[in-house]
């Protein structure tokens, strides 16, 4: 971003208001909805992005789970409470005083309750499985080329350290990207896998969060990779706590 007033923008988050009124005349950008100052050299947290998007229409989905503890975002959009660092607060409530606990990616991990509901800690989502189906192509993509391209994408576009891309699986037409990041592995300045997955999800839907950058143009050896559908599964360091009624 640049100090020249007309060009003071946030390359990594178009849902911001920017002005060169930061310290020393620095271009400073604040997330819409929350007014929190964001670091435009890296991804903005999913919580602040959801807060900025609060007026957007609901986007409810129901997904098949790969195992009993995997969570999916069935609840769609909501206006989250974020802490001063932009992380999700462990307990989220709506205007009708219905509350629930969320994980570090903001996905509900308990039954809904009232204001007496306690969420002792923000439980970290340490494993994310991104399940993609690509549009039909003349032939299957070469697995190692596909693996390399997706790793490059997460490294260069989302600035995610390569060590956090655990694996890329491929069985035409299904691609699975596994992201893993334990609390102990995440150093200061590391992009969170939840934020990278959210940016990727929005990119794939043609709703890029990047400022003025073209949409996602994924190519494997020149062949376009067009995604038909995306399912994202979230696994937490501590299994979620739902009543049996919900599981049946």
């Amino acid at each position: 971003h640049t100090a020249a007033q007309d060009n003071c923008t946030c390359p990594t988050n178009k849902m911001t208001v920017c002005s060169p009124d930061g310290p020393g005349g620095r271009c400073q950008c604040r997330a819409l909805g929350s007014g929190v100052a964001v670091d435009c050299s890296t991804l903005t947290s999913k919580c602040l992005l959801l807060k900025a998007r609060m007026s957007a229409p609901k986007n409810a989905r129901t997904l098949v789970r790969p195992n009993e503890h995997a969570l999916v975002d069935n609840d769609g959009l909501y206006d989250p409470d974020c802490d001063p660092e932009g992380r999700f607060k462990a307990r989220q409530c709506n205007q009708t005083s219905v509350c629930w606990c969320v994980n570090s990616v903001g996905v509900r991990r308990t039954d809904k309750g009232d204001l007496s509901l306690r969420c002792d800690e923000l439980v970290r989502t340490h494993h994310i499985l991104i399940d993609l189906r690509h549009r039909p192509t003349a032939g299957a993509f070469n697995h190692s080329d596909l693996d390399a391209e997706l790793r490059r994408l997460f490294r260069e576009r989302y600035r995610l350290h390569p060590k956090f891309v655990a694996a890329v699986h491929y069985e035409q037409p299904t691609i699975q990207i596994e992201l893993r990041q334990n609390t102990s592995q995440k150093a200061a300045g590391d992009v969170d896998i939840g934020d990278a997955a959210y940016y990727f999800e929005r990119d794939v839907k043609g709703e890029s969060l990047f400022q003025g950058r073209g949409g996602l143009d994924l190519r494997v050896r020149g062949e376009p990779l067009q995604v038909e559908r995306t399912l994202i599964y979230y696994l937490d360091e501590i299994p979620p706590k739902f009543s049996m009624k919900r599981l049946t």
Partner: antibody
Framework: QVQLVQSGAEVKKPGASVKVSCKAS????????INWVRQATGRGLEWMGW????????GYAQKFQGRVTITADESTSTAYMELSSLRSEDTAVYYC?????????????WGQGTMVTVSS | DIQLTQSPSSVSASVGDRVTITCRAS??????LAWYRQKPGKAPKLLIY???SLQSGVPSRFSGSGSGTDFTLTISSLQPEDFATYYC?????????FGQGTRLEIK
């Protein structure tokens, strides 16, 4: 070329005020903020405050709050720093500086400095 | 206010030497750090901004690194014009603050 040219040296008595000017040229004045930094002889750099000439927003270091006023005249592309209630410890070289084009809060263009001496 | 502490306060070196100056912030400042060189009677000159980005026109012998609280300015091979005072400066939060300076002298 891009430059900031400051007014000449000043000698003031304790309790008086001083107004230093900083004329910008070579770029669009209202596109960039102006910072003021001072340096006493043999000492380090001390940031005093800043102004965005387009919005009129200002920010001052707590130490100078109430004593310093930064203004700008768009028509002449000139910024001003006025320091009141002068004391001997305000004797210093006063610099104006422009933030870098990258918007990173670093100062890439500096004035040549104005020596202000406060002496009875 | 964020305090910036430079070390060493002064250093003696010879032309061709490699010199490293450090700047420690009292709290995290992300990468909002700049480095300047100042010669006697002159205004400071910007060398490095955003902790590691080289200012246009500055020789490549200057490099910066670090983020958070610990930062380094390295001059890979000292030239005669490099004997001066060096300052770090943060722009993470108001007020902008500078380090106390490091004097680089000829040995």
């Amino acid at each position: 070329q891009v430059q900031l040219v400051q007014s000449g040296a000043e000698v003031k008595k304790p309790g008086a005020s001083v107004k230093v000017s900083c004329k910008a040229s070579g770029y669009t004045f209202t596109n960039y903020g102006i910072n003021w930094v001072r340096q006493a002889t043999g000492r380090g750099l001390e940031w005093m405050g800043w102004m965005n000439p387009r919005s009129g927003n200002t920010g001052y270091a707590q130490k100078f709050q109430g004593r310093v006023t930064i203004t700008a005249d768009e028509s002449t592309s000139t910024a001003y720093m006025e320091l009141s209630s002068l004391r001997s410890e305000d004797t210093a070289v006063y610099y104006c500086a422009r933030p870098n084009t990258g918007g990173d809060g670093a100062f890439d263009i500096w004035g040549q400095g104005t020596m202000v001496t406060v002496s009875s | 206010d964020i305090q910036l502490t430079q070390s060493p306060s002064s250093v003696s070196a010879s032309v061709g030497d490699r010199v490293t100056i450090t700047c420690r912030a009292s709290q995290g400042i992300s990468s909002w750090l700049a480095w300047y060189r100042q010669k006697p009677g002159k205004a400071p000159k910007l060398l490095i901004y955003r902790a590691r980005s080289l200012q246009s026109g500055v020789p490549s012998r200057f490099s910066g690194s670090g983020s958070g609280t610990d930062f380094t300015l390295t001059i890979s091979s000292l030239q005669p014009e490099d004997f001066a005072t060096y300052y770090c400066q943060q722009a993470n939060s108001f007020p902008v603050t500078f380090g106390q300076g490091t004097r680089l002298e000829i040995k």
